[in-house]
């Protein structure tokens, strides 16, 4: 199932997603979708790139991250409640039906109304994992969401509940990381 | 107005190779937000997607492995069409073969447009 | 592969009823399930994608509904011109794959 990420009406939403290339300046195409992940590609398409550079995108959802390194981490801009959803981060790797695929839920909570202005939660210190169930067709995922001031007893905890589910075949120590070669 | 016409013969023979052409018309085989399929149907197994060819910076392919050893769909941007061959047919491979197109809303992996379709015998 | 099994397999009914056609998808496929009529000799149509959005020019007696595994195509006032076989198809899961049909026919 997805995870939820959050963010208030006005802020900037941040939807985690990343991938190792397999040499730097090897890339893979992406895209990002609002939707669940389809059987190809992704519906309603936001943004895509290609094995060079970002090749298509809409206003307010851009990568901030450095996608040559393998963040395609969403950002959309000036959330409202209308982006609530699910959004697809599809990792299109080459050969037939490799592509990684993970649904990430965003929920817009309106904007609290307080008398000084809060600082945004920066999301990109907080510690998204996933895991992915590797195996013949589309992997399954499932994203932990956000684990801030996770330690490292935490983490061995963590993997220790999880050893024995399908889901738990790659716990990763950078995030929602697929390895590519 | 988008339309798919295909061509190509109507009986082939066992262990033979099966051609079939799909022209455009009113878009690109090239595009970048189209995908190009054939899928093919049959009393005995219904419907079957088989594979599809795309464009999107580079050109890429998507096969059932039903198929995948067999088939090879190849876009010809100069005639702006695509085809399908699967090799080694046998009887079992009679059916009416259809081209389609995916990708009108923005949505992948059902179809907007049908070509008319080729019924295709495989007998000696 | 996930398995589509629509029902029932044919059904007569008089013009100006409602027709509902079921499709089971064997797991969950969220939502991403067409709907196609295909008359008899002709291509297939689509009627219906996203379990629920109709598709331009479809003729709005024809809706779509459900989510998780069961799914629905209902023809309200049946007209002489829906006289086809219905399939539905989805596209969540890697192969696509198609229900059997439903022949509908004029009683």
């Known amino acids: 199932s997805e995870v939820e990420y959050r963010a208030e009406v006005g802020q900037n939403a941040y939807l985690p997603c990343f991938y190792t290339p397999a040499a730097p300046g090897n890339l893979v195409p992406v895209c990002w979708g609002k939707g669940a992940c389809p059987v190809f590609e992704c519906g309603n398409v936001v943004l895509r790139t290609d094995e060079r550079d970002v090749n298509y995108w809409t206003s307010r959802y851009w990568l901030n991250g450095d996608f040559r390194k393998g963040d395609v981490s969403l950002t959309i801009e000036n959330v409202t409640l209308a982006d609530s959803g699910i959004y697809c981060c599809r990792i299109q790797i080459p050969g037939i039906m490799n592509d990684e695929k993970f649904n990430l839920k965003l929920v817009i909570k309106p904007a609290k109304v307080t008398p000084a202005p809060t600082r945004q939660r920066d999301f990109t210190a907080a510690f998204p994992r996933m895991l992915t169930t590797r195996g013949h067709g589309p992997a399954e995922t499932q994203t932990l969401g956000s684990l801030p001031d996770i330690n490292l007893t935490q983490i061995s905890t963590l993997a220790n509940e999880l050893r024995d589910s399908r889901l738990a075949n790659d716990l990763r120590d950078s995030g929602a990381t697929i390895r590519i070669g | 107005q988008m339309q798919l016409q295909q061509s190509g013969p109507g009986l082939v023979k066992p262990s033979q190779t099966l051609s079939l052409t799909c022209a455009i018309s009113?878009?690109?085989?090239?595009?970048?937000?189209?995908?190009w399929n054939w899928i093919r149907q049959s009393p005995s197994r219904g419907l079957e997607w088989l594979g599809r060819?795309?464009?999107?910076?580079?050109?890429?392919?998507a096969f059932a492995v039903s198929v995948k050893s067999r088939i090879t769909i190849n876009p010809d941007t100069s005639k702006n069409q695509f085809s399908l061959q699967l090799n080694s047919v046998t009887p079992e491979d009679t059916a009416v073969y259809y081209c389609a197109r995916e990708g009108s809303s923005g949505w992948y992996g059902y179809v907007h447009h049908w070509g008319q379709g080729t019924l295709v015998t495989v007998s000696s | 592969e996930i398995v589509l099994t629509q029902s029932p397999a044919s059904l007569s009914v008089s013009l100006g009823e409602t027709v509902t056609i079921e499709c089971r998808a064997s797991?969950?496929?969220?939502?991403?399930l067409a709907w196609y009529q295909q008359k008899p000799g002709k291509s297939p149509q689509l009627l219906i994608y996203n379990a629920n959005s109709l598709h331009t020019g479809v003729p709005s007696r024809f809706s779509g509904s459900g989510s998780g595994t069961q799914y629905s195509l209902k023809i309200n006032s049946l007209q002489s011109e829906d006289v086809a076989s219905y399939f539905c198809q989805q596209y969540y899961d890697y192969p696509p794959t198609f229900g059997q049909g439903t022949k509908v026919e004029i009683k």
């Open positions: 060819t795309y464009y999107r910076s580079k050109w890429y392919s």
């Open positions: 797991e969950d496929i969220y939502n991403g």
């Open positions: 009113g878009d690109s085989v090239s595009s970048n937000s189209a995908a």
